[in-house]
Every structure is written in C-alpha cells, then in structure tokens.
Amino acid sequence: FERTRSLQDPCSNCPAGTFCDNNRNQICSPCPPNSFSSAGGQRTCDICRQCKGVFRTRKECSSTSNAECDCTPGFHCLGAGCSMCEQDCKQGQELTKKGCKDCCFGTFNDQKRGICRPWTNCSLDGKSVLVNGTKERDVVCGPSPADLSPGASSVTPPAPAREPGHSPQ
C-alpha cells in the first residue's frame, strides 16, 4: 500500500523538515529558515511561532518542530501551548478582572495565581485548630478537642511539606 501510494503521490516520500515543492517538479525541498514541517508529505512548511514581548522562548524552532514559548517572570501560561500570559499576583491575593486584590478574611491563596480558597473547617472532621489561617496559609488542624483534655499528650505538628503547586498547562 505504501509503495502504491508513493507511486501515485510523490509528495508522500518527503520527510518531516521538508515540503513537496510544486515549483520544482514535486522535489522534496528543505523548509526555509523560520519554518518547519512536523510530518512527512506536506506541501508547505508552517511558519515558526515567535516568542515576543511577555512570551519567552522555551524551545527553539527546528525544521521539524515549532518553537515553544513560556512566560517571562511575573506572568504564567494559560491555554494549550501557552497561548496567553497572565500576570501573577502575590501570595495572599487573587487576580480579579480588575487586578490583584487581597484575600478576604477566612480565605487564603498560597499560589501566585488562581483565586482565594476558604480555610479548612477543622470541626467538620472532628478536629480543632492548631494554627490559625492567614491570607497566605490555610489553618492547620490538630487533634480532636476531646484529645486535648488535661493529661492528654501534646501533639507535635509535622514539619511543613510543599503545598500543592502549579501544574504545567
């Protein structure tokens, strides 16, 4: 089948990084500078993405793959392939459509993106508050109030581990 197809369509023999040049009797020509073809048999090469302004180059364009962009410091990616850069806020803030604003009492944000999250309600799991929450940190729940009766052994809170962090989008 492959051989039959290539007899019918000489372009199918052109590998990635080349294009089938109709102006040169369907010869496979290399992609010109600043362009690429990621699959074989293409009749044109695609223009490389340029990472300008708030975008910065994460991976250079090659003849067989497009450039990849991420965001300059102070911004983060949104959308497939980092189609947009959005400004970071500080921890303890959320980005509204009017800019960064502090988390309201009872909420926190330990990230530089996203919105403020309500503090954990320790009592719902039968626990007590060991460390109060702040704008930047959730409350830390301790043992249940019954465990804190006189004579009960004190509980040493665990060393803080890394809080949930960013996922590459």
């Epitope: 509204t96 403020c116 309500p118 503090w119 959730d138 996922s167």
Partner: antibody
C-alpha cells in the same frame, strides 16, 4: 501520564456507609488537591468536597457536611471518600478529579467513576 | 450560587452551537466547561472562560461577560453530542464548587 483509578462498583443498604478509593499515578500526589464529584441517574454533576493531600485539610459542600469524610494515604497515593447514612438518592456515579495546582481553574484529570447503588 | 443552563440545544452538523450559562455577575468569575458523554468521565474542554486544554480542538471556544458565559462549538460533528456543564469556584466555605444543571447538545 496522569491516571486516577477508582475502586469498583458497590451495592449498599440504606443507612450503611460506603468508602470509595482513588489511586493516583503519574504525578506528585501530595502536590495537587483532589476533589470528589457525583452524578445521580438522570441528574447533573454535583461537587462534594476536596482534600489537600499534603496537609489533609478538607472542605465539603454544605449539603454533605456531617455525612461525608474525605481522607488520603500519601504512602500509596490514594484518596478516599466515605459517605455515611446512605439513602436511595445517594445512588450515583462518584468521581475523583484533580485540581491543576491552583484554586479557581478547571479539574483537569478525572477517575473513571464508581457506581454506588443504595437499595434495600 | 445558581448557574442556569438551557436543558438542550439542537444543531445540524456543520453548524455552530452556543450553550449559555447564566449567573449573577458571572462575568466577574472564571467559568469552566466540561463535556460529559454517557458512561464516560467528564472532560474539561474550556477553563477560565476561554482557554482550551491540550488536545481540545480550536473549534471549541468560550467567552464570559455580564451575567452570561457561553460555550461555542463551531462546525459541529456527531461526536460532539454530549451533555455540557459550566462550573465556577467560589471563596465561600459552604458552596465552593457549583455546577450548572447541564445542557444536552443534540445533533440533528
């Protein structure tokens, strides 16, 4: 690749409890909040609660407070959702879903779902 | 915290479907959309109003302003037939996660 694999279907009697598990792989389990969402037959999606696997901190929808408990075992990268005092209208498919690293974005990976049937 | 969706939207193949999600000042929130097919887990198709995760086709887009968010599917195909849900996160401790009632997209 990220995968969330849930425990199998359960049949329970009214008043009983059910505990559904969700085993995560392909990423750092402690680094991402896990949510639970359910869908009853012929109904829409309903958010139940979340857990921070790192701290164990939770939050539950008011409707389920007092009946739902979400826990985790970081040593085996597994989250659990236990629902008590089951009623017939708790018959639903229960899903775990991962938050993508910050609050306010969409849930990017979902388990395959666990059917819980409550019937006498 | 109520998100209102039409129960169903019907569209012919190749046409454009628009599914709305209404809520008080929803334009100030970040809206996410999920596709749900029978016996399958939901799939995130648009997040934070208008961004597509990797693997979601460009013909799916979202917008959000005022009291209405909209999911738009252009050049609709038979495989797009599914239920679609909007969703918003709030900073309230009692109702952090809210879904709309869902819209069945029917391909004529």
């Amino acid at each position: 690749q990220v995968q969330l694999v849930q425990s199998g279907a359960e049949v329970k009697k009214p008043g009983a409890s059910v505990k559904v598990s969700c085993k995560a792989s392909g990423y750092n389990f402690s680094g991402y909040y896990m949510h639970w969402v359910r869908q009853a037959p012929g109904q829409g999606l309903e958010w139940m609660g979340w857990i921070n696997p790192n701290s164990g901190g939770t939050n539950y929808a008011q409707k389920f407070q007092g009946r739902v408990t979400i826990t985790r075992d970081t040593s085996i990268s597994t989250a659990y959702m236990e629902l008590s005092r089951l009623r017939s209208d708790d018959t639903a498919v229960y899903y775990c879903a991962r938050e993508p690293g910050y609050y306010g974005s969409g849930l990017d990976y979902w388990g395959q779902g666990t059917l819980v049937t409550v019937s006498s | 915290y109520v998100l209102t969706q039409p129960p169903s939207v019907s569209v012919a193949p190749g046409e454009t479907a628009r599914i709305t999600c209404g809520g008080d000042d929803i334009g100030d929130k970040r809206v996410h959309w999920y596709q749900k097919k029978p016996d399958q887990a939901p799939v995130l198709v648009v997040y934070e109003d208008r961004y597509r995760p990797s693997g979601i086709p460009e013909r799916i887009s979202g917008s959000n302003s005022g009291n209405t968010a909209t999911l738009t599917l252009s050049r609709v195909e038979a495989g797009d037939e599914a239920d679609y849900y909007c969703q918003v996160w709030y900073s309230s401790p009692d109702h952090p996660g809210v879904f709309g009632g869902g819209t069945q997209l029917i391909i004529l």
